[in-house]
Interface confidence: low
């Protein structure tokens, strides 16, 4: 999916109002210095591409993010503010309806969500130069 035509300010508002808090809740009990933020993005469409990948792609070490509250709110924001996004996600949504929520938060998941926090912060400051 090409995120170029999303309403970035509306997505930013959704992040600031709810998604950011859900990410913090997920990471509660983890030191903010525990993980280096290495995952990067160069502009807002690229940030959303990476955010989608880390949030919804199944991974070898962390498979349970898609059913987390921040993930469901992320999906809702993208569906509402990115034209045509929901159509591209129909198959994925049907798969998710079958999915059982994993009760275990693995360390790999914590690392992954830490990277997501970095991507979202970068998304909110698109004019900053890359380090």
């Amino acid at each position: 999916y090409d995120f170029t035509n999303c309403d970035f300010e509306k997505i930013k508002a959704a992040y600031l109002s709810t998604i950011s808090k859900d990410l913090i809740t997920y990471m509660s009990g983890t030191k903010s210095t525990e993980f280096n933020n290495t995952v990067s993005c160069s502009n807002r469409p690229h940030c959303l591409t990476e955010i989608q990948s880390l949030t919804f792609n199944p991974t070898a070490g962390c498979a349970s993010l898609a059913k987390e509250m921040f993930a469901m709110k992320t999906k809702a924001a993208l569906a509402i503010w990115c034209p045509g996004y929901s159509e591209t996600q129909i198959n994925a949504t049907q798969a998710m309806k079958k999915a059982r929520k994993s009760k275990v938060t693995t360390n790999k998941c914590l690392e992954q969500v830490s990277q997501l926090q970095g991507l979202w912060r970068r998304f909110n400051r698109p004019l900053l130069k890359q380090q």
Partner: antibody, heavy 121, light 112 residues
Framework: EVQLVESGGGLVQPGGSLRLSCAAS????????MTWVRQAPGKGLEWVSS????????YYADSVKGRFTISRDNAKNSLSLQMNSLRAEDTAVYYC??????????????WGQGVLVTVSS | DIVMTQTPLSLSVTPGEPASISCRSS???????????LHWYLQKPGQSPQLLIY???HRASGVPDRFSGSGSDTDFTLKISRVEAEDVGVYYC?????????FGGGTKVEIK
């Protein structure tokens, strides 16, 4: 163009050391987990080691645990494999690959050309 | 460790004919998220392996639609609907459900 280029292979005596390097280009290196896979002459593929994008988690095959060390430098887009106490059975072509955890269920979607390591006296 | 077993060891196919390779795992590759962590690779003669299929049935970028993957739990199949000369090589399955990640022993496909 997405590319992985390995270097550092060669002939080494049993018990010796070698350091393999992998230079990545054409993609945001720090956004991907990386994996080393090897292939002994005329044999199949064997997973060696994986490292997550932030180096927070590292995994090794039992056959190399305690002898090999995987590392990465995201600032330099490079992956390394330090191989110590080498044995004849470590003789193989070593492939640097992208994946092993973060995308597409851990499948390895980009492979380098491979570098030959020969352990012999 | 999860053991991956491929059959047959080798396969000789007439161009235009179908081909099928089986891969069996010693335990289920189905995760509680409903994804199954089984992938297929092709190593052409003298080349590095390349990803063909990921997560059982998803074709990797640039892979022709004559390749398809299917299966579930512990039994998986790679099918080539019409074999072409460029399809020769060794096919490997791999599991990434848990470390150590493991590959099948490979199936060599050649043209008759």
């Amino acid at each position: 163009e997405v590319q992985l280029v390995e270097s550092g292979g060669g002939l080494v005596q049993p018990g010796g050391s070698l350091r393999l390097s992998c230079a990545a280009s054409g993609f945001t290196f720090s956004n991907y987990d990386m994996t080393w896979v090897r292939q002994a002459p005329g044999k199949g593929l064997e997973w060696v080691s994986s490292i997550t994008f932030a180096s927070s988690y590292i995994y090794y095959a039992d056959s190399v645990k305690g002898r090999f060390t995987i590392s990465r430098d995201n600032a330099k887009n490079s992956l390394s494999l330090q191989m110590n106490s080498l044995r004849a059975e470590d003789t193989a072509v070593y492939y640097c690959t992208r994946g092993g955890g973060a995308y597409y269920g851990g499948s390895l979607d980009v492979w380098g050309q491979g570098v030959l390591v020969t352990v012999s006296s | 460790d999860i053991v991956m077993t491929q059959t047959p060891l080798s396969l000789s196919v007439t161009p235009g004919e179908p081909a099928s390779i089986s891969c069996r795992s010693s335990q289920s590759l189905l995760h509680s998220n409903e994804y199954t962590y089984l992938h297929w690779y092709l190593q052409k003669p003298g080349q590095s392996p390349q990803l063909l299929i990921y997560l059982v049935s998803h074709r990797a970028s640039g892979v022709p639609d004559r390749f398809s993957g299917s299966g579930s739990d512990t039994d998986f199949t790679l099918k080539i609907s019409r074999v072409e000369a460029e399809d020769v090589g060794v096919y490997y399955c791999e599991q990434t459900l848990q470390t150590p990640f493991t590959f099948g022993g490979g199936t060599k496909v050649e043209i008759k």
